[in-house]
């Protein structure tokens, strides 16, 4: 057994089996390039402003870094896809969905018709799905991440759809309105089994979801609180109920981070009682997004993630542990429930 | 209820410097957010934004004026103070304080105070 | 410093009537990060708008702003007797924040 000599040159998890020897990591780690070393990945904050989009160390003191983009006006809504270690973000001024590797290279526009205000968005990571919402044309909608296939998901009383989080893995995705009456609404990652969870709220932002705690975080723009509740909408409670105009919000490990506009500021507390508050950065104008870019955030698994759910097109997932495959505008789903055809 | 209140003296001499206080209520520059901006007008003109000073104690200026201005704030006296070297009777206005609870953005304002230059 | 230039320098309408004042930037000051204030004689300025579109507190709904990249606009949809005054855009997508030269509206 190869393994049996200095662990196979492994640092921490050597696995024998027929087809050769093979290094692999604990839960937390990854494997380097080398093929042989685990470390963990460095965390980093992701956050828009203007025609920036910067990186901050969650573990070292590189601070406040942009990402090299060129031709970015108004970036807005940010995610990430952490396989490829890709970037996505949406321009408001531009009317454009763009993507590029963290290092700033292979930019490009995945969306570019059809926008108005995409003010939400968010990478389904395991179908490898892109899901935005948009201010302006009232709609939801959903491509694969290259912007191909894309679909309408939700239109119907949508009231200037804002904030967009996925929970995968469970086959959720849930937003934000910010019209008549806000509200925080959940549906099927294909648009069915529509539910308003939190009617009694302002204009909630920065929706972002606890994968491990299971529990719901966003901050509300009239109230400038920051609350949370259970995935249900249920067992609210206040987190920081002091700021004075709390905007965008992430959350990672035992700590939410979020920004302020009336202090300029990325700050952070812990999750749960708001406690032990830091200033990450200070003297920052209206940062619009803030995000934690680490493979922790993109864990889990569905049938989408397994050979796309043997669907032509998109495969959305949907509760519990299900999916359906969804087909692009004008094209209709054959028989067999896979493929589409064309009009 | 935010108030704000400009005080200095409503005539100043050529090459003098000129200092204004704002007094204001309603607000706290410590750790609540927000910040305190100058402005003026000089008399049947437009407005022009001077500096700002943020409750974490960030400063901008003017790009003209920079050489010239200085802005501080004392937060135990609810206070900012503008100081404007040589004075010059181009610089006759009324000079305004502002409050920023978002950034750049003047949502309450002094009634203003008048000062001329002249010799 | 990016030059805000407001147009018409003068509007003379009659109350009910709909006002259109306009605000174009030298350069491209995105979505968000216009304000315009409105100033009456021996009066300071107060707040109407910011973000662009956001009314300010206690401001009428007949204020409404628009606009966005170099071109915004300022809306009046039914003159009150109260409106006639000054109006100034302010940017501050850009350091330093200008301010436009004004459009009076006054009453014809």
């Known amino acids: 057994n190869p393994c049996a000599e200095e662990n196979g040159g492994c640092s921490h998890l050597c696995l024998y089996r027929p087809q050769g020897l093979r290094c692999a990591c604990p839960i937390g780690f990854e494997l380097i390039s080398d093929m042989k070393t685990c470390i963990v990945p460095e965390a980093f904050l992701l956050f828009s402003r203007r025609a920036d989009i910067r990186r901050i160390s969650l573990e070292t003191n590189n601070n406040n870094v942009a990402i090299p983009l060129t031709g970015v006006k108004e970036a807005s809504a940010l995610d990430f896809d952490v396989t490829d270690n890709r970037i996505y973000w949406t321009d408001i001024s531009l009317k454009t969905i763009s993507r590029a590797f963290m290092n700033g290279s292979a930019l490009e526009h995945v969306v570019e018709f059809g926008l108005d205000y995409p003010e939400g968005m968010a990478v389904d990571w395991l179908g490898k799905n892109l899901y935005w919402a948009d201010t302006g044309t009232n709609r939801i909608e959903v491509s694969k991440l290259d912007g191909q296939h894309r679909q309408v998901l939700v239109w119907k009383d949508l009231d200037s759809p804002r904030a967009l989080a996925l929970d995968p893995a469970e086959g959720f995705m849930y937003w934000t309105e910010w019209g008549g009456k806000p509200k925080i609404d959940r549906a099927a990652m294909d648009g069915s089994e529509r539910t308003t969870l939190v009617p009694n709220v302002g204009r909630a932002n920065g929706l972002t979801i606890d994968y491990a705690k299971r529990r719901l975080y966003w901050t509300d723009l009239d109230t400038n609180l920051i609350e949370s509740s259970n995935m249900l909408g249920l067992n609210r409670e206040v987190i920081a109920d002091d700021l004075p105009h709390p905007f965008g919000l992430t959350q990672y490990q035992d700590y939410i981070y979020w920004t302020d506009w009336s202090r300029r500021s990325i700050e952070r507390a812990n999750k749960t009682s708001g406690q032990n508050r830091t200033i990450i950065q200070g003297h920052l104008d209206y940062v619009m997004d803030i995000l934690v870019f680490h493979s922790s955030r993109q864990s889990g698994w569905n049938e989408c993630a397994s050979s796309n759910g043997h669907c032509s097109h998109l495969c959305l997932a949907v509760p519990v542990g299900g999916f359906v495959c969804g087909c692009p505008a004008h094209y209709s789903l054959n028989a067999d429930n896979r493929t589409c055809s064309a009009p | 209820q935010v108030q704000l209140k400009e005080s200095g003296p409503a005539l100043v001499k050529p090459t003098q410097t000129l200092t204004l206080t704002c007094t204001f209520s309603?607000?706290?520059?410590?750790?609540?957010?927000?910040?305190v901006g100058w402005i003026r007008q000089p008399p049947g003109k437009a407005l022009e934004w001077l500096a700002w000073?943020?409750?974490?104690?960030?400063?901008s200026y003017s790009t003209s004026l920079k050489t010239r201005l200085t802005i501080s704030k004392d937060t135990s006296k609810n206070q900012v103070v503008l100081t404007m070297t040589n004075m010059d009777p181009v610089d006759t206005a009324t000079y305004y304080c502002?409050?920023?609870?978002?950034?750049?953005?003047?949502?309450?304002w002094g009634q203003g105070t008048l000062v001329t230059v002249s010799s | 410093d990016i030059v805000l230039t407001q147009s018409p320098a003068t509007l003379s309408l009659s109350p009910g009537e709909r006002a259109t004042l306009s605000c174009r930037a030298s350069?491209?000051?995105?979505?968000?990060?216009l304000a315009w204030y409105q100033q009456k004689p021996g009066q300071a300025p107060r707040l109407l708008i910011y973000?662009?579109?956001n009314r300010a507190t206690g401001v009428p709904a007949r204020f409404s702003g628009s606009g966005s990249g170099t071109d915004f606009t300022l809306t009046i949809s039914s003159l009150e007797p109260e409106d006639f005054a000054t109006y100034y855009c302010?940017?501050?997508?850009?350091?330093?924040?200008?301010f436009g030269q004004g459009t009076k509206v006054e009453i014809k």
């Open positions: 302010q940017q501050y997508y850009d350091y330093p924040q200008t």
């Open positions: 973000g662009a579109s």
């Open positions: 309603g607000f706290s520059l410590s750790n609540r957010g927000g910040g």
């Open positions: 350069q491209f000051i995105g979505s968000r990060y």
């Open positions: 502002a409050r920023m609870h978002l950034p750049l953005v003047f949502d309450s």
């Open positions: 000073i943020d409750w974490d104690d960030d400063k």
